[in-house]
Amino acid sequence: IWELKKDVYVVELDWYPDAPGEMVVLTCDTPEEDGITWTLDQSSEVLGSGKTLTIQVKEFGDAGQYTCHKGGEVLSHSLLLLHKKEDGIWSTDILKDQKEPKNKTFLRCEAKNYSGRFTCWWLTTISTDLTFSVKSSRGSSDPQGVTCGAATLSAERVRGDNKEYEYSVECQEDSACPAAEESLPIEVMVDAVHKLKYENYTSSFFIRDIIKPDPPKNLQLKPLKNSRQVEVSWEYPDTWSTPHSYFSLTFCVQVQGKSKREKKDRVFTDKTSATVICRKNASISVRAQDRYYSSSWSEWASVPCS
Amino acid sequence: RNLPVATPDPGMFPCLHHSQNLLRAVSNMLQKARQTLEFYPCTSEEIDHEDITKDKTSTVEACLPLELTKNESCLNSRETSFITNGSCLASRKTSFMMALCLSSIYEDLKMYQVEFKTMNAKLLMDPKRQIFLDQNMLAVIDELMQALNFNSETVPQKSSLEEPDFYKTKIKLCILLHAFRIRAVTIDRVMSYLNAS
């Protein structure tokens, strides 16, 4: 058993049929010595008396808020949560496996630039009695500070019969140099509590590997005289690291017809303009990627060809 | 310790092309190593990230763009002495700071070159003959060093008398290639910045 936060404890249980469970001793936080009784949750049934209560925790029915009283007055609370271990593996029931970029990916993180700011998100089908808390650091043995905000519900989607909820959190490395060469990864730890179930999820990454620029901005077309070609121009996104001559981007320009069955025309360039063949009902899209370190491409910025 | 804006004219910077070739070559070599050594811990997640130039050169700090010198987190107090001449400078206006930067890059390349050559000698003794260093990558390192054209003492190639542990050598190769790729990215960024300034 260990303390998650004040008055909240996690009991780690091997979860199998007829498992013996864990013996837990609860101590009432009071100078009082006698006349103390214990109850669980909303029940008025007295579980025991005395300053300490010894219980055998085997299942979720044994978890919950234990309260010690004296003469009708509440003295203190202890909330017991369960963390299940099945076949030597901690349970991952609360979050959905996003399976990208690989199986068992519960947390996904992205950064728009090298400033040390990044966003992580996760998915669940659970809508109520759910809390998250997020901690992060650079490295684990001698951790350097990363400050994370509160996790918030960022999107709701309907997937077949189920509703899916996306939560996200923003974090900022306390003293980040955009030009630094990372040798220690960022560690992100998410504590998830659903009712009386506790789970924790972790992710480890280098900022350079989770970079995904915003789409190029100010995408414009200039038709060339007496030609079916157009000059496409754009600018670096505002959120990208500066100076741009140091943090350079490369771009992919795509001409795509109205149908996915039509062949695409793609041009790759380091410049912020390109000349492509335009055609009726097609659209021109541009996306960006770090020129020197191939992490993710940005989303497309698009304009119609006409 | 930063790069001033008064640097060579655009297009007058012969190292940009070489640094791009370097990044391409090391990326290809790393990809080849990851494929060939698929049953070894050779991915970014599996290896320890070591920097053989740590405390010996300070390329990131010496080559910091002017715009980032206001960022406290980017300023490091480490001092390193550098030799200050070189043909990539291509301009009399070139400052001491830029010479410091390019000299640091040269020292990086020299250290990696020695490590890679030593490692290749060991890998050539491996009866499995599983992986060798791409001669193109070694040639590209050499070309960039020549373009930088700094005079510096030759570092003797390390030789070891004991029988090489080929497993450890291959792990070390992965660590070295990952670190060198990161440094090659920094070098490319620096050359691009200098070329544009």
Epitope: S227, Q229, K260, R266, V267, I277 | -
Partner: antibody, heavy 114, light 106 residues
Framework: QSLEESGGRLVTPGTPLTLTCTAS????????MTWVRQAPGGGLEWIGT????STYYASWAKGRFTISRTSTTVDLKMTSLTTEDTATYFC????????????WGPGTLVTVSS | LVMTQTPASVSAAVGGTVTINCQAS??????LAWYQQKPGQRPKLLIY???TLTSGVPSRFKGSGSGKQFTLTISGVQREDAATYYC?????????FGGGTKVVVV
């Protein structure tokens, strides 16, 4: 507006050959350009297409045939030629992409024989 | 992608009607064109987008269909229509000609 292919000749098997397509009366760089061939007495066979810089090839042509363009020409580079490659080679202009070929050259004959 | 064109040859009397079919192995929406080629000549585009007539092509030529099944119909066949006709279908990666249909006008 017209197209003309050049470079067709008698070659021995294994010899590389490059065919060139030039345009009159319009700018080649404004169009998707396609190469098609026709063996003597046979049907039309699509080889491949070049857009601004993207290229697409028939599966049998991949690796052996390469299409490239300059501002004034479109080239078809052929390697490892066999007698099966004997054909008239046409270049054609796409109205939108590469299936609606509205302008064709007269063709150039390539004969592969030992 | 495979384009199967039928029949391989067809005879028609002047004023008659000829129907040529083209079947795609997968859905190609309307990315299909019809070409006419006379002996010793270069091919000529008749119809594109499955049913759009190229300017200057007589209205007796009609294209129809979408997805996998396409048809070229020549109504009121003329002597000058004697030629080989090819369909050409395209998807997002490749483009394929049908085997051709030889039209003989008697």
């Amino acid at each position: 507006q017209s197209l003309e292919e050049s470079g067709g000749r008698l070659v021995t098997p294994g010899t590389p050959l490059t065919l060139t397509c030039t345009a009159s009366g319009f700018s080649l760089s404004s169009y998707w350009m396609t190469w098609v061939r026709q063996a003597p007495g046979g049907g039309l066979e699509w080889i491949g297409t070049i857009a601004t810089s993207s290229t697409y090839y028939a599966s049998w042509a991949k690796g052996r045939f390469t299409i490239s363009r300059t501002s004034t020409t479109v080239d078809l580079k052929m390697t490892s030629l066999t007698t099966e490659d004997t054909a008239t080679y046409f270049c054609a202009r796409g109205l939108t992409t590469d299936y609606d070929l509205d302008l064709w050259g007269p063709g150039t004959l390539v004969t592969v024989s030992s | 992608l495979v384009m199967t064109q039928t029949p391989a040859s067809v005879s028609a009397a002047v004023g008659g009607t000829v129907t040529i079919n083209c079947q795609a192995s997968e859905d190609i929406e309307s990315y299909l064109a019809w070409y006419q080629q006379k002996p010793g000549q270069r091919p000529k585009l008749l119809i594109y987008s499955a049913s759009t007539l190229t300017s200057g092509v007589p209205s007796r030529f009609k294209g129809s269909g979408s997805g996998k099944q396409f048809t070229l119909t020549i109504s009121g066949v003329q002597r000058e229509d004697a030629a080989t006709y090819y369909c050409l279908g395209a998807d997002d990666t490749t483009t394929v000609f049908g085997g051709g249909t030889k039209v003989v006008v008697v």
